[in-house]
């Protein structure tokens, strides 16, 4: 039985402060069952950036189409960029639980922010 | 095309057992949870069990007496169900799960059923 | 546990009128809901999911719509074949996933 794999295939993303940064991060499988939270930072400490089911995130966006079937990509794209946005982001897959279960982290996506063009 | 076809069903005494399997086909079965559904006579559905990869879940109301596994080699599903009470007469479905990618599990192809009676 | 209300149990209605059964929600499950058909002797079958998009192959006359707690199943013009037993099931917070009790399409 093949792992699930959370592929985010860019290292770093580099965005002009004001427009918006596309985070892209795909899965192997559609199983096992759970979420899918995107956050910045690592550890306890770690900031949620994105749950479908929770929250309310204004600035954060899926690339595809929520109600799209069987769908495994989980790219989000964040808009209105500004130096506080800078830091590694991470896409992670949950095993369904009660509490949900971290099952596999992406490798991370740094942001840095350049300033706006004058 | 997609099928699934249960078997295994019957009639069995309160306290017994009884292992229902549903065959899979027209679909790549590992890469999806799979379910099992029930509905009494007369009744309404009633989720049982579901199972992604390893990761199982159940209803309270069977939890601990029934066992839901997989065999990915032989795109096959099993239900196995034991200490059986009256309360478990229903006609058992397996179903193939469907996922909104955020979002959770509906079932988008279900078997034709398979009818286990608990009685003495 | 979400608890799931159709209504009405039974909606008597004739050919060619329009339809509308109705599932509530006891807590808001967003746009997770399902809805099917089923026929005496056979199985559900999926008519709508995430609350409004068809399942391929389902006439348009079926529709979905509402969020949140109240939900709506719209059959634009009842045909013969239409006459069942219609479920809601909602799949945003699980397990269990939970259906509701039914709602029983029959000939007026």
């Known amino acids: 039985e093949e792992e699930l794999q959370v592929i985010q295939p860019e290292k770093s993303v580099s965005v002009a402060a004001g427009d918006s940064a596309t985070l892209n991060c795909t899965v192997s499988s559609l199983i096992p069952v759970g979420p899918i939270q995107w956050f910045r930072g690592a550890g306890p400490g770690r900031e949620l950036i994105y749950n479908l089911k929770e929250g309310h995130f204004p600035r954060v966006t899926p690339v595809s189409d929520p109600t799209k079937r069987n769908n495994m990509d989980f790219s989000i794209r964040i808009s209105n960029i500004t130096p506080a946005d800078a830091g590694t982001y991470y896409c992670v897959k949950f095993r369904k639980g009660s509490p949900d279960v971290e099952l596999k982290s992406g490798a991370g996506t740094e942001l840095s922010v350049r300033a706006k063009p004058s | 095309e997609v099928q699934l076809l249960e078997s295994g069903g019957g009639v069995v005494q309160p306290g017994g057992s009884l292992r229902l399997s549903c065959a899979a086909s027209?679909?790549?079965?590992?890469?999806?949870?799979v379910t099992w559904v029930r509905q009494a006579p007369g009744k309404g559905l009633e989720w049982v069990s579901t199972?992604?990869?390893?990761?199982?879940y159940y209803a309270d109301s069977v939890k601990g007496r029934f066992t839901i596994s997989r065999d990915n080699s032989k795109n096959t599903l099993y239900l196995q169900m034991n200490s059986l009470r009256a309360e478990d007469t229903a006609v058992y479905y397996c179903?193939?799960?469907?996922?909104?990618?955020?979002?959770?599990?509906?079932?988008?192809?279900w078997g034709q059923g398979t009818l286990v009676t608990v009685s003495s | 546990e979400i608890v799931l209300t159709q209504s009405p149990a039974t909606l008597s209605v004739s050919p060619g009128e329009r339809a509308t059964l109705s599932c509530r929600a006891s807590?808001?499950?967003?746009?997770?809901l399902a809805w099917y058909q089923q026929k005496p002797g056979q199985a559900p079958r999926l008519l709508i999911y995430?609350?409004?998009i068809r399942e391929t192959g389902i006439p348009a006359r079926f529709s979905g719509s509402g969020s949140g707690t109240e939900f709506t199943l719209t059959i634009s013009s009842l045909q013969s074949e239409d006459f069942a037993v219609y479920y809601c099931?909602?799949?945003?917070?699980?397990?269990?996933?939970?259906f509701g009790g039914g709602t029983k399409v029959e000939i007026k």
């Open positions: 099931q909602q799949y945003y917070d699980w397990p269990p996933f939970t």
């Open positions: 807590q808001n499950v967003k746009n997770d």
């Open positions: 199972i992604g990869s390893g990761d199982t």
């Open positions: 179903a193939k799960d469907s996922t909104v990618s955020w979002s959770g599990d509906f079932f988008d192809y």
């Open positions: 027209g679909f790549s079965f590992s890469n999806f949870a």
């Open positions: 995430a609350a409004r």
